[in-house]
């Protein structure tokens, strides 16, 4: 039993850091592996994740972290059983995926103007809570070429448009998701989608 | 240049308390308490991490001992409970950049357990 792509994993920078790797063939994760993760900090002790399969030969083992700080750096093993497969480390601040933004919302009842406002996925203690920049991605369900995509790079976790940028009469659907500068994240996940139907008065045309 | 100052030490009886107390200047990712008692190896005993949230402890004080800092002062404490005879030591509060702890030390402070 080998290892053929080597573990790589992406913290949440909040709770959990997820670590996926390929085996050299088809691998029942949970009962053969077992990835043991360690905090480099003096007292410290070991921690076991239990794999989850993620496609044939693919695992995936989620780590549980009481928190995130910018200095934190952990140990990896991975075992087989009494054999060290892989030995590596992992500097949560260095790999972030921000978590997912929720309760995405379109309020329609400002005059022809729609609000959309979303939920920071980070309690206010936690670094990234003022470090989030935003992407709203906007597609109408009728028309696959009615796509955009507005970026949101003020902290307020919102975004206005006047309702008369988008076509009258059909339905839309937004989503957003985040990421944050200051450590070069990757975009978290979308959140899910949310749908309305878009309607405003046509302005009065004078001849 | 950093500066550790301990406070709180003295003689206590089996089965009392004592708050150990830790000035420093400056904030550390590091924060913990050493012992070392005569004739033996320093040893840790507590760590902290930044933050205040992920505490660490030696088996041998777990569930007497408890580790916290103060960030608005940054102050370091030990509340050391049920003591006993073994706990007789000079503790050091140390403070560190990484986890290993032990960049600057402060002078140490006494407790001694006796009836």
């Known amino acids: 039993m080998k290892v053929l792509q080597e573990p790589t994993c992406v913290s949440d920078y909040m709770s959990i850091s997820t670590c996926e790797w390929k085996m050299n063939g088809p691998t029942n994760c949970s009962t053969e592996l077992r990835l043991l993760y360690q905090l480099v900090f003096l007292l410290s002790e070991a921690h076991t994740c239990i794999p989850e399969n993620n496609g044939g030969a693919g695992c995936v083992c989620h780590l549980l972290m009481d928190d995130v700080v910018s200095a934190d750096n952990y140990t990896l093993d991975l075992w087989a059983g009494q054999q060290l497969l892989w030995k590596g480390s992992f500097k949560p601040s260095e790999h972030v995926k921000p978590r997912a933004p929720g309760n995405l919302t379109v309020h329609t009842n400002v005059s022809d103007t729609l609000l959309l406002t979303w939920s920071n996925p980070y309690p206010p203690d936690n670094y990234l809570y003022n470090h989030l920049t935003y992407a709203v991605n906007i597609w109408s369900e009728n028309d696959p070429a009615d796509f955009r995509i507005y970026n949101v790079t003020y902290l307020e976790p919102s975004l206005r448009i006047a309702a008369s940028t988008l076509k009258s009469g059909i339905s839309y659907r937004a989503r957003v998701r985040a990421w944050a500068q200051c450590y070069n994240t990757t975009w978290s996940e979308w959140s899910p989608s949310t749908k309305w139907h878009n309607s405003y008065r046509e302005p009065f045309e004078q001849h | 240049q950093v500066q550790l100052v301990e406070s709180g030490g003295g003689l206590v009886q089996p089965g009392g308390s004592l708050r150990l107390s830790c000035a420093a200047s400056g904030d550390f990712y590091c924060m913990a308490w050493f012992r070392q008692a005569p004739g033996k190896e320093r040893e840790a005993v507590a760590t902290?991490?930044?933050?205040?949230?992920?505490?660490y402890y030696a088996d041998s004080v777990k569930g007497r001992f408890t580790i916290s800092r103060d960030n608005s002062k940054n102050t370091l404490y030990l509340q050391m409970n049920s003591l006993k005879a073994e706990d007789t030591a000079v503790y050091y509060c140390a403070v560190g950049v990484d986890g290993n702890c032990r960049n600057y030390w402060g002078q140490g402070t006494l407790v001694t357990v006796s009836s």
């Open positions: 902290i991490r930044s933050g205040g949230r992920s505490t």
